[in-house]
């Protein structure tokens, strides 16, 4: 058993049929010694008396808010949550496996630049009685500070018969060094509590591996005289790290016909312009990627040819 | 060329070669993670690699103030990785074909380090750890880790030379 926060405790249980469970001793936070009784949740049934209460925690029915009273007055509370371990593996019932980039990916994180700011998100089908708490650091043995905000519900989607809820959190490294080569990864830890079930999820990454620039901005077409060619130009997204002579991007320019089946013409360039042939009813799209490190491409910025 | 005395390197040549290094490093190891090669016996194998750290002067301001600290750090790293890529880690099994980007990567690391430090000048180099794994799985795990680490190192080096070529070239 360990303390998650003040008056909230997590009991770690091996979860299998007829498991013996864990013996837990609760102590009433009071100077009083006599006349103390214990109850669980809203029940008025007295579970025991005395300054301490010993219970055998085996299932969710044994978890909940234990309260010690004296003469009708509440002295203190202890909330017990369960953390299940099945076949040596901690349960992951609360969050959905996003399966990208690999199986057992519950947390996904992205950064728009090298400033040390990043966003993580996760999915669940649970709509109520759900709380999240997020902590982060750079490195684990001698951790350096990363400050995370509160997790918020950022999107709701309907998937078949189910509703899916996306939560996200923003974090900022306290003393980021954008130009340095990271040697210690960022660690992100999410505590999830659904009713009386506790689970924790972690992710470890370098900012460089989660970089995904915003799409190029101000995408424009300039027809070239007496030609089917156009000059496409664009700019670095505002959110990208500066100076651009140091934090450089590379770009992919694509000409795509109306039909998905039509052959796509692609050009790669380090410049912020390119000359392409604009076909009727086609559109021109540009996306960006770090020039020197193959992290994610941005989403496409697009304009119609006509 | 950068010499310990402090003259400028051939920024544009360094820029071109460092960008080529980035491409080769990703050709040699394009994936972000390797699946079932469990990190057994992974005794801090690549923790001794030289990293370009915050105080090494490789940020735009540091380069403007005095690029020598940063160039020395980059040179140190290039020599370190060049030695690793020429070692038994990369010559033993699993077999690399002669068309492997690792061969070109090895040659390009040497080429860039020579651009930074011509013969007759000596910056101190970091001691390379004696790693001679006997099993193919250990060797492969080390290769992946070294190449991942090299990708990060050459990305910073390429940014330095691109910025230098754009703002510090005479």
């Amino acid at each position: 058993i360990w303390e998650l926060k003040k008056d909230v405790y997590v009991v770690e249980l091996d979860w299998y049929p007829d498991a013996p469970g864990e013996m837990v001793v609760l102590t009433c936070d009071t100077p009083e010694e006599d006349g103390i009784t214990w109850t669980l949740d809203q029940s008025s049934e007295v579970l025991g008396s005395g300054k301490t209460l010993t219970i055998q925690v085996k299932e969710f029915g044994d978890a909940g808010q234990y309260t010690c009273h004296k003469g009708g007055e509440v002295l203190s509370h202890s909330l017990l949550l369960l953390h299940k371990k099945e076949d040596g593996i901690w349960s992951t019932d609360i969050l959905k496996d996003q399966k990208e980039p690999k199986n057992k990916t519950f947390l996904r994180c992205e950064a728009k630049n090298y400033s040390g700011r990043f966003t993580c998100w996760w999915l669940t089908t649970i709509s109520t009685d759900l709380t999240f708490s997020v902590k982060s650091s750079r490195g684990s043995s001698d951790p350096q500070g990363v400050t995370c905000g509160a997790a918020t519900l950022s999107a709701e989607r309907v998937r078949g018969d189910n509703k899916e809820y996306e939560y996200s959190v923003e974090c900022q490294e306290d003393s980021a060094c954008p130009a340095a080569e990271e040697s210690l990864p960022i660690e992100v830890m999410v505590d999830a509590v659904h009713k009386l079930k506790y689970e924790n999820y972690t992710s470890s990454f370098f900012i460089r591996d989660i970089i995904k620039p915003d799409p190029p901005k101000n995408l424009q077409l300039k027809p070239l005289k007496n030609s089917r060619q156009v000059e496409v130009s664009w700019e670095y997204p505002d959110t990208w790290s500066t100076p651009h002579s140091y934090f450089s991007l590379t770009f992919c320019v694509q000409v795509q016909g109306k039909s998905k089946r039509e052959k796509k013409d692609r050009v790669f360039t380090d410049k912020t312009s390119a000359t392409v042939i604009c076909r009727k009813n086609a559109s021109i799209s540009v996306r960006a990627q770090d020039r020197y490190y193959s992290s994610s491409w941005s989403e496409w910025a697009s304009v119609p040819c006509s | 060329r950068a010499v310990p005395g402090g003259s400028s390197p051939a920024w544009t040549q360094c820029q071109q070669l460092s960008q080529k290094l980035c491409t080769l490093a990703w050709s040699a190891h394009p994936l972000v993670g390797h699946m079932d090669l469990r990190e057994e016996g992974d005794e801090e194998t690549t923790n001794d690699v030289p990293h370009i750290q915050c105080g090494d002067g490789c940020d735009p301001q540091g380069l403007r103030d005095n690029s020598q600290f940063c160039l020395q750090r980059i040179h140190q790293g290039l020599i370190f990785y060049e030695k690793l890529l020429g070692s038994d880690i990369f010559t033993g099994e699993p077999s690399l074909l002669p068309d492997s980007p690792v061969g070109q990567l090895h040659a390009s690391l040497l080429g860039l380090s020579q651009l930074l430090q011509p013969e007759g000048h000596h910056w101190e180099t970091q001691q390379i750890p004696s790693l001679s794994p006997s099993q193919p799985w250990q060797r492969l795990l080390l290769r992946f880790k070294i190449l991942r680490s090299l990708q990060a190192f050459v990305a910073v080096a390429a940014r330095v030379f691109a910025h230098g070529a754009a703002t510090l070239s005479p």
Partner: antibody
Framework: EVQLLESGGGLVQPGGSLRLSCAAS????????IHWVRQAPGKGLEWIGY????????KYNENFKGRATLSADKSKNTAYLQMNSLRAEDTAVYYC?????????????WGQGTTVTVSS | EIVMTQSPATLSVSPGERATLSCKAS??????VAWYQQKPGQAPRLLLY???TRHTGIPARFSGSGSRTEFTLTISSLQSEDFAVYYC?????????FGGGTKVEIK
């Protein structure tokens, strides 16, 4: 698009010779090794060796050394497998293949194969 | 040379069912193993490399696992187009060698 096209198969007498060709297109011919793999009827795959056209250096499976000769003609973007002293057990479909660019020999591109029958 | 032993030689499975193919190397090959699918009259087609990395365009129902000497190819839900012969291949050591193949047939 990378394409490999084998030719030169056919019926050969035991003890005879044969030269198979593999015409490559869609990539820089000198950049990658070209491998030869064969498959006897109803049997598995057997690696014969490779040629690296950049420096014409071959590497052979010891089981084929002395009987197989690998070469390449850079001007024609074509690799060759010369097989001598053929026996009935050399009857097989012969494939050329090229591996991934990372320098490890998993084979991404294969030719359609050319059939060699050794029989009197 | 490294001997790659595949089992079973033939696997009879109904469409929609799961197929598990095994491949054992006679010595450590790390994860330098590829899997190929071959249909009659066609060249082999690459499915996986590094024991578990799917090649471009290969459906997610194909997955691989294992390291050093024991490897598995799993087809989670067999489609009609998956009935074929499957070969494992080690590219760790010269000469590169292939397993004898597992024929996956309709039950």
């Amino acid at each position: 698009e990378v394409q490999l096209l084998e030719s030169g198969g056919g019926l050969v007498q035991p003890g005879g010779s044969l030269r198979l060709s593999c015409a490559a297109s869609g990539y820089t011919f000198t950049d990658q090794t070209i491998h030869w793999v064969r498959q006897a009827p109803g049997k598995g795959l057997e690696w014969i060796g490779y040629i690296y056209p950049r420096d014409d250096s071959p590497k052979y499976n010891e089981n084929f050394k002395g009987r197989a000769t690998l070469s390449a003609d850079k001007s024609k973007n074509t690799a060759y497998l010369q097989m001598n002293s053929l026996r009935a057990e050399d009857t097989a479909v012969y494939y050329c293949a090229i591996p991934d660019r990372s320098g490890y020999a998993w084979f991404i591109y294969w030719g359609q194969g050319t059939t060699v029958t050794v029989s009197s | 040379e490294i001997v790659m032993t595949q089992s079973p030689a033939t696997l009879s499975v109904s469409p929609g069912e799961r197929a598990t193919l095994s491949c054992k190397a006679s010595r450590d090959v790390a994860i330098a193993v590829a899997w190929y699918q071959q249909k009659p009259g066609q060249a082999p087609r690459l499915l996986l490399y590094w024991a578990s990395t799917r090649h471009t365009g290969i459906p997610a129902r194909f997955s691989g696992s294992g390291s050093r000497t024991e490897f598995t190819l799993t087809i989670s839900s067999l489609q009609s187009e998956d009935f074929a012969v499957y070969y494992c291949h080690q590219y760790s050591s010269y000469p590169f060698t292939f397993g004898g193949g597992t024929k996956v047939e309709i039950k």
